[in-house]
């Protein structure tokens, strides 16, 4: 069971300082941006991180949403990352959900975050280069100190 608490507006970056945004095709991508680029591309660069109470606490449970014309929420259904047109729900009557991730602070690096899927234990949000695009994917952690699954989260409130 997950119960919604508070939400905050955030900019999410990978460790190469590329900014996460949602493109016109609703794909979550990373791109080099100056601070003014980041502002100019809002709301596509501003993510709503909603925190949830967890009946079996396994970390800070969150959903990640974006509000362009409508609100879309990040999902990892079938281990495929996509934004689904939906509001983060007030309650989720299950112990796992494709839209709930555990936001974890990397020990020794308070400012570095990982997002582990609640549906797929050991799978994390990651940045992966595919041709010329830097995509947000779900990835099984397979090597120690994998930088691709680490992010910084800057609050915009």
């Amino acid at each position: 069971y997950f119960g919604k608490l508070e939400s905050k507006l955030s900019v999410i970056r990978n460790l190469n300082d590329q900014v996460l945004f949602i493109d016109q095709g609703n794909r979550p991508l990373f791109e080099d941006m100056t601070d003014s680029d980041c502002r100019d591309n809002a709301p596509r660069t501003i993510f709503i991180i909603s925190m949830y109470k967890d009946s079996q606490p396994r970390g800070m449970a969150v959903t990640i949403s974006v509000k362009c014309e409508k609100i879309s929420t990040l999902s990892c259904e079938n281990k495929i990352i996509s934004f689904k047109e939906m509001n983060p729900p007030d309650n989720i009557k299950d112990t796992k959900s494709d839209i709930i991730f555990f936001q974890r602070s990397v020990p020794g690096h308070d400012n570095k975050m990982q997002f582990e899927s609640s549906s797929y234990e050991g799978y994390f949000l990651a940045c992966e280069k595919e041709r010329d695009l830097f995509k947000l994917i779900l990835k099984k952690e397979d090597e120690l100190g994998d930088r691709s699954i680490m992010f910084t989260v800057q609050n915009e409130d």
Epitope: L5, M51, K53, P57, G59, T95, R104, S105, L144
Partner: antibody
Amino acid sequence: EVQLVQSGAEVKKPGSSVKVSCKASGGTFKSYAISWVRQAPGQGLEWMGNIIPMTGQTYYAQKFQGRVTITADESTSTAYMELSSLRSEDTAVYYCARAAYHPLVFDNWGQGTLVTVSS
Amino acid sequence: DIVLTQPPSVSGAPGQRVTISCSGSSSNIGNHYVNWYQQLPGTAPKLLIYRNNHRPSGVPDRFSGSKSGTSASLAITGLQSEDEADYYCQSWDYSGFSTVFGGGTKLTVL
């Protein structure tokens, strides 16, 4: 760098209660769990329970259920552990520990508070 | 009521490699992650290894963790005098909510 600073040593009589504080500085307090772990003289570590300040949720080890109360004050970034009906076996060093990665991965520890229960 | 079993003591000469074992069951280590803590004399414990084999920043790569079945182990290579300490394993339940520690192992550097 997060620092956890605990209150000073206590000497208590059997049957009484003790309340130990743990003040966090230099990091986010409310969204992480604060656990309490004790260590009797020359013995190992024993988890007592924890609190997630943002939600107020508390979880207690079965052994301490009904005897321990863990609270948190977000305004002062302080967590508290109160243990009642003290007995001599409760003589131990009590540690608070922060968990930012997972509620049971203790990545930052207080310096410890010695509680002595003696008549 | 110690659920995880560790040897009470291990020893090694400087520069040597030592391992500390931690034995559990399917209800803890067999299905869940293992963490290791180092406690230097007179100080609070310090997180050494988390999630079986991850090192927090600042922990030397001389320390490594592994897990197989219902047992886990901590390996320390290039033993140094400052490694003399008590070492505790801990396992946690991912879906429920409980944690258990081993009884601790005293490492002596000869």
